[in-house]
């Protein structure tokens, strides 16, 4: 849960319900402009471990659309454009918060949910397992 | 905002407040095990564009701790361990949802906020600008 400092002048809450259920204002304060990740940069194409972004939609979740990265190659792309299979393209994963409608289909009731998404790919040196 | 299917059996809401403010259950449903990103994999160290993870803490935000990646080099690490400055290490950024206490210090009232975080780094071919 969340550590909860108390303060007068806050919206009222009943202790039996608290802090499990809170009020959340959905008028998002956006510190950055929200874009399709493909438009925000072309790193997915210029990387030595390039990736594609796959759209996943779920109307019971907010945000309803998330993008998952999938590496294009098992290896990494060399300067000549060929793939080096002595290196590995791997997904970088990030845990994110989403809101899940609960009960289902309800417009104004949600549960916080953590999900793991792949954001992009990076090129790593493989771990070599030496057999005795 | 959120597309809002209506359903009987949902918690009640007043139209004047709706759907700007919703109820959110903070008992997080965690689809994946939550870990310090350093422990989840060692890609940050094995990548050709390695990064360090910096802890960012804000008690007025949930999650209060987020980890920001910072690329270690301007270039990318070659097989011999030297840095190739003909390539660039760049951060992969992801827009995430956080809850911001509003009004400040209130335990049970939040506003949804989108912030941009750097999740890791990838190695890209630089864009070369040719001067006429």
């Amino acid at each position: 849960g969340i550590a909860i400092p108390r303060n007068s002048g806050c919206p009222n809450s009943e202790d039996k319900n608290f802090p499990r259920t809170v009020m959340v204002n959905l008028n998002i304060h956006n510190r950055n402009t929200s874009t399709n990740p493909k438009r925000s940069s072309d790193y997915y194409n210029r990387s030595t471990s390039p990736w594609n972004l796959h759209r996943n939609e779920d109307p019971e979740r907010y945000p309803s659309v998330i993008w998952e990265a999938k590496c294009r190659h098992l290896g990494c792309v060399k300067a000549d454009g060929n793939v080096d299979y002595h290196m590995n393209s791997v997904p970088i994963q990030q845990e994110i918060l989403v809101l899940r409608r609960e009960p289902r289909h309800c417009p104004n009731s949600f549960r916080l949910e953590k999900i793991l998404v792949s954001v992009g790919c990076t090129c790593v040196t493989p771990i070599v397992h030496h057999v005795a | 905002g959120i597309a809002i299917p209506r359903n009987s059996g949902c918690p009640n809401s007043e139209d004047k407040n709706f759907p700007r403010t919703v109820m959110v259950n903070l008992n997080i449903h965690n689809r994946n095990t939550s870990t310090n990103p350093k422990r989840s994999s060692d890609y940050y160290n094995r990548s050709t564009s390695p990064w360090n993870l910096h802890r960012n803490e804000d008690p007025e935000r949930y999650p209060s701790v987020i980890w920001e990646a910072k690329c270690r080099h301007l270039g990318c690490v070659k097989a011999d361990g030297n840095v190739d400055y003909h390539m660039n290490s760049v951060p992969i950024q992801q827009e995430i949802l956080v809850l911001r206490r509003e009004p400040r210090h209130c335990p049970n009232s939040f506003r949804l906020e989108k912030i941009l975080v750097s999740v890791g780094c990838t190695c890209v071919t630089p864009i070369v600008h040719h001067v006429a």
Partner: antibody
Framework: EVQLVESGGGLVQPGRSQKLSCVVS????????MTWIRQAPGKGLEWVAS????????YYPASVKGRFTISRDNAKSTLYLQMNSLRSEDTATYYC??????????WGQGVMVTVSS | DIVMTQSPSSLAVSPGETVTINCKSS????????????LAWYQQKPGQSPKLLIY???TRQSGVPDRFIGSGSGTDFTLTISGVQAEDLAVYYC????????FGAGTKLELK
């Protein structure tokens, strides 16, 4: 050595449910998308379901959407296929496959599911 | 949805011959931003699981003999087996995958 081993097949009555499992070894499971493919007796290959490496994104063809659910447990290196409201046309050998990238580079031996009364 | 049409459906060959299997898609499988064709070829021998031969239209999977050659771009693709051997008798499938997966109906390679 990469291995994918399916289990959970057998005879099931129409309208009933069945859950298939696929235990994998020999690779870092949570780096790869996984897919179930099926093959009806004497027929071609048909896509059944796919799941992203994190498990957060799933994809289905219209023929099974709403009846089948793909899931994974990365801690156990196991892929699942929950099949509900089974029909006779779901009778097939079900293959667990690894998506190398945009191709299926490793396949399990397959498990037979027979839907019949 | 993308439809993959394979031809011929069956093919009778003698060992040593060169055979060509065609696969035509209803939409282009070439992604301009990645400069790749999302097409793969599989071989399935009787009683066995399918095996990956070719991916991205022309890249041979590790361990696959060089007599298997994939070619084509956009909507028209070809699998060529030069100098067919008895062990090559199998069903061959083309396959497209991006978000969804689509397979051709298969081409059965038989002995003449």
């Amino acid at each position: 050595e990469v291995q994918l081993v399916e289990s959970g097949g057998g005879l099931v009555q129409p309208g009933r449910s069945q859950k298939l499992s696929c235990v994998v070894s020999g690779f870092t499971f949570n780096n790869y998308w996984m897919t179930w493919i099926r093959q009806a007796p004497g027929k071609g290959l048909e896509w059944v379901a796919s799941v992203s490496n994190t498990g957060s994104s799933t994809y289905y063809p219209a023929s099974v959407k709403g009846r089948f659910t793909i899931s994974r447990d990365n801690a156990k290196s196991t892929l699942y296929l929950q099949m509900n409201s089974l029909r006779s046309e779901d009778t097939a050998t079900y293959y667990c496959t690894r998506e190398g990238a945009y191709y299926l580079d490793y396949w399990g031996q397959g498990v037979m599911v027979t839907v019949s009364s | 949805d993308i439809v993959m049409t394979q031809s011929p459906s069956s093919l009778a060959v003698s060992p040593g011959e060169t055979v060509t299997i065609n696969c035509k898609s209803s939409q282009s499988l070439f992604w301009s931003e990645s400069h790749m064709n999302y097409l793969a070829w599989y071989q399935q021998k009787p009683g066995q699981s399918p095996k990956l031969l070719i991916y991205y239209a022309s890249t041979r999977q590790s361990g696959v003999p060089d007599r298997f050659i994939g070619s084509g771009s956009g909507t028209d693709f070809t699998l060529t087996i030069s100098g067919v051997q008895a062990e090559d008798l199998a069903v061959y499938y083309c396959h497209h995958h991006y978000d969804s997966h689509t397979f051709g109906a298969g081409t059965k390679l038989e002995l003449k």
